[in-house]
């Protein structure tokens, strides 16, 4: 799917607030706080465009931010492995500066028994061995240091941990005679916390466990366990969250029903019920004691573990998630899209917004896409007009201020921002689409009729005209 | 309304085993856990232990050993078993709802006496 | 285990007057991440089942009037009466639910009205 999708930048405008470094005390670590933008509202722009130059004309003093990669390290505990035995690992790129760690959970989807896992093996290695990993690995989105592209937290400390355990980060058992893979996702989250405290984040503030696709669902079923391990070795004081992208699925219906052949057409709750057998899979205890022996698989549904967990969490969905989608027997081949399967996918979409409801922290456009926090362009996405860096800045400001009396939003920061309009890419920020066939980029007019949305029937219930929809969706408002 | 209800023997000899059941209503034992408390008279509350909604269930360490509780979800019952009675098991028995994933009680049964004595 | 100390045991008050318990824990009961306490009070009268008042060290139940305040944070929480009326003659326990098994209790504070 990454190769259908391209990013379009937004018309220039200011971006979210960088993070300000505080003059530290004599022999104290830097350390960044959140701007009180109260003072400037009525001169949001001309400020933005002066602290921007100001990041900019000073970002080149700091040495050791020219160097964009994240080094490899090979745990040193070897018994902690990928799925075929080669020791699991985590890249790293220090800011010592920085009491901020960012730990990025990769995706890749996953494996359920011996014969997928084989085939796994055979044509995705790296997902599942760490013997051909790169020595370093350049920092993208979320995971880059370079304020342009990352406004939100360009200056943490960043560590992207490579997926190899083929196990939605759950798993919990050695290679062995009997056991031909290894399945340690969650272990290896344990090991990297583990040996990451000998560098630097025993000093941590705040460590944002962050993951995409399968690592968005490693970061829900593994956020409050990173918290006890922290709070059981000594550190209660540093403040685990969460960030899950594209990790939030449904066990809904299938649009068509397959049998569970293999791990793209078996449905999820299937390809989870027999994974967490042939891992030993593990999940956080307060959802697992919410449902019977063997029905754990319950809890890597974002929507039944969200409620248990201790540790705040800021969601990520794309309300027309391509991997659910996939999941769900959708496959959008490039013929026009019948009534059935477009009242499906806009329910899909519906059901996701629904889920979403009580989620405070959370970010969901109406796009067909999958995936968004270490894409380069992962700040021109917005929703009711807030890009996702500023977005995740509101919720570092409404954690600050969690412990004041005000649990009433932030004025002008929103948290909570959740498309509200039913089809896919009614939201004119959406990544572009291309076609399959032929990789012509695809305007949204284009794009809906593709889908076989008729823009009378689209535009009937906005109260609108076709071509007042049709300019409305191209200008972007 | 949410509602538990205790129901036990009352008085019992020492070395028998201690049965009460806690019938609950408004609310499902599929959804929520329910914990056991004690209070021997005069003094504070004990907690003893939890059924969860999924059936797992959590004993205090220092009586783990002669307490099971157990649930019938369909007949809306939680069940609480103490064997190896001694007279400082005299007691009220509580049972009470939680709140749905932590250790809050926010309703509780109207409790049931238990003497041990010969 | 978490242990639970309230003091004073006992306190004697005249109606109006206001009334502050204390409740200390062995171990924090603040979880950095969510900065949230792990602690409860309840209140027993005479002959009759404990009631929830407070959650989360300062959340009243509904239903509970608004002269019962909870504080505090870490191992030292307080429950204010901020004018005593005589329904408030019962014994109030602190509970921890940061850790478990077990939940436990702090030995109670008895108001008694003059």
């Known amino acids: 799917s990454e190769g259908r999708k391209t990013w379009r930048r937004r018309g220039q405008q200011p971006p979210p607030p960088p993070r300000t470094e505080a003059a530290p005390a004599a022999g104290q670590p830097v350390e960044s706080f959140p701007l009180d933008f109260t003072a400037v509202e009525g001169n949001m722009d001309s400020f933005m465009a002066q602290v921007k130059s100001l990041a900019q004309s000073l970002y080149p003093c700091s040495a050791q931010q020219l160097n964009e990669d994240l080094r490899l390290h090979l745990l040193l505990n070897t018994s902690v492995t990928c799925n075929d035995g080669s020791p699991a690992g985590y890249y790293l790129k220090e800011s010592r500066g920085s009491r901020r760690w960012l730990l990025f959970l990769e995706g890749g989807w996953y494996c359920f028994n011996r014969e997928n896992c084989d085939s796994r093996y055979d044509t995705m290695r790296r997902l599942m061995s760490s013997r051909d990993w790169p020595r370093t690995r350049t920092g993208t989105g979320i995971l880059s240091s370079q304020p342009e592209e990352n406004p939100y937290w360009w200056n943490a400390n960043m560590v992207f941990i490579p997926y190899c355990s083929s196990d939605v980060w759950s798993g919990a058992s050695s290679k062995s005679e009997k056991n031909e893979y290894a399945f340690m996702g969650a272990l290896i989250i344990q090991e990297v916390v583990r040996e990451l405290l000998g560098r630097g984040l025993s000093g941590a503030k705040v460590l944002l466990l962050a993951g995409s696709s399968a690592g968005g669902t490693g970061v829900l079923l593994n956020v409050d366990r990173v918290a006890e391990q922290l709070e059981k070795l000594g550190y209660p004081a540093i403040q685990v969250r969460g960030l899950a992208d594209s990790g939030w699925f449904l066990d809904n219906k299938q649009y068509r029903h397959t049998d569970c052949v293999d791990t793209i057409t078996c449905a999820p709750t299937e390809a989870i019920r027999r994974g967490i057998r042939y891992w030993n899979g593990v999940v956080p205890e307060r959802c697992r004691r919410q449902f019977q022996e063997g029905e754990e698989w319950n809890c890597f549904f974002g929507y039944k573990v969200y409620p248990t967990l201790r540790c705040p969490v800021f969601v990520v969905q794309w309300l027309f998630d391509e991997a659910q989608l996939t999941v769900d027997n959708v496959h959008l081949t490039g013929q026009p899209v019948q009534e059935g399967l477009r009242l499906y996918i806009q329910n899909l979409g519906r059901e996701l917004r629904h889920t979403l409801k009580d989620v405070p922290a959370s970010f969901a456009p109406a796009c067909l896409s999958h995936e968004i926090i270490i894409r380069s362009h992962w700040t021109d996405v917005q929703v009711k007009g807030t890009s996702l860096p500023r977005a995740l800045h509101c919720w570092d400001r409404s954690l600050h201020d969690s412990h004041k009396a005000s649990k009433t939003p932030l004025k002008g920061c929103p948290v909570h921002l959740v498309d509200s309009c039913p089809w896919p890419h009614c939201n004119p920020s959406c990544p572009t689409v291309r076609d399959q066939f032929t990789g012509q980029e695809m305007n949204v007019a284009q794009f809906l009729m593709h889908m076989g949305f008729d823009m009378q029937t689209v535009a009937q219930p906005q109260g609108l005209e076709p071509s007042e929809l049709l300019g409305m969706l191209s200008n972007g408002s | 309304q949410v509602q538990l209800k205790e129901s036990g023997p009352g008085l019992m000899a020492p070395s028998q085993s201690l049965s009460i059941t806690c019938t609950v209503s408004?609310?499902?034992?599929?959804?929520?856990?329910v914990s056991w408390i004690r209070q021997p008279p005069g003094k504070g509350l004990e907690w003893l232990g939890v059924i969860w909604a999924g059936g797992s269930t959590d004993y205090n360490s220092t009586l783990k050993s002669r307490l099971s509780i157990s649930k019938d979800n369909s007949k809306s019952q939680v069940f609480i078993k103490m064997n190896s009675l001694q007279t400082d098991d005299t007691a009220m028995y509580y049972c009470?709802?939680?709140?749905?994933?932590?250790?809050?009680?926010?309703?509780w049964g109207q409790g049931t006496t238990l003497t041990v004595s010969s | 285990d978490i242990v639970m100390s309230q003091s004073p045991s006992s306190l004697a008050v005249s109606v109006g007057e206001k009334v502050t318990m204390t409740c200390t824990s062995s171990?924090?009961?603040?979880?950095?991440?969510?900065?949230?306490?792990?602690l409860a009070w309840y209140q027993q009268k005479p002959g009759q089942s404990p009631k929830l008042l407070v959650s989360w060290a300062s959340t009243r139940e509904s239903g509970v009037p608004d002269r019962f305040t909870g504080s505090g944070s870490g191992t030292d929480f307080t429950l204010t009466i901020s004018s005593v009326e005589a329904e408030d003659l019962a014994v109030y326990y602190c509970?921890?639910?940061?850790?478990?098994?077990?939940?436990?209790f702090g030995g109670g504070t008895k108001l008694e009205i003059k």
């Open positions: 009470a709802k939680q709140n749905r994933y932590d250790g809050i009680f926010d309703y």
């Open positions: 171990q924090s009961l603040l979880f950095s991440s969510n900065q949230k306490n792990y």
């Open positions: 509970q921890q639910y940061y850790s478990y098994p077990p939940w436990t």
């Open positions: 408004g609310f499902s034992l599929t959804d929520y856990g």
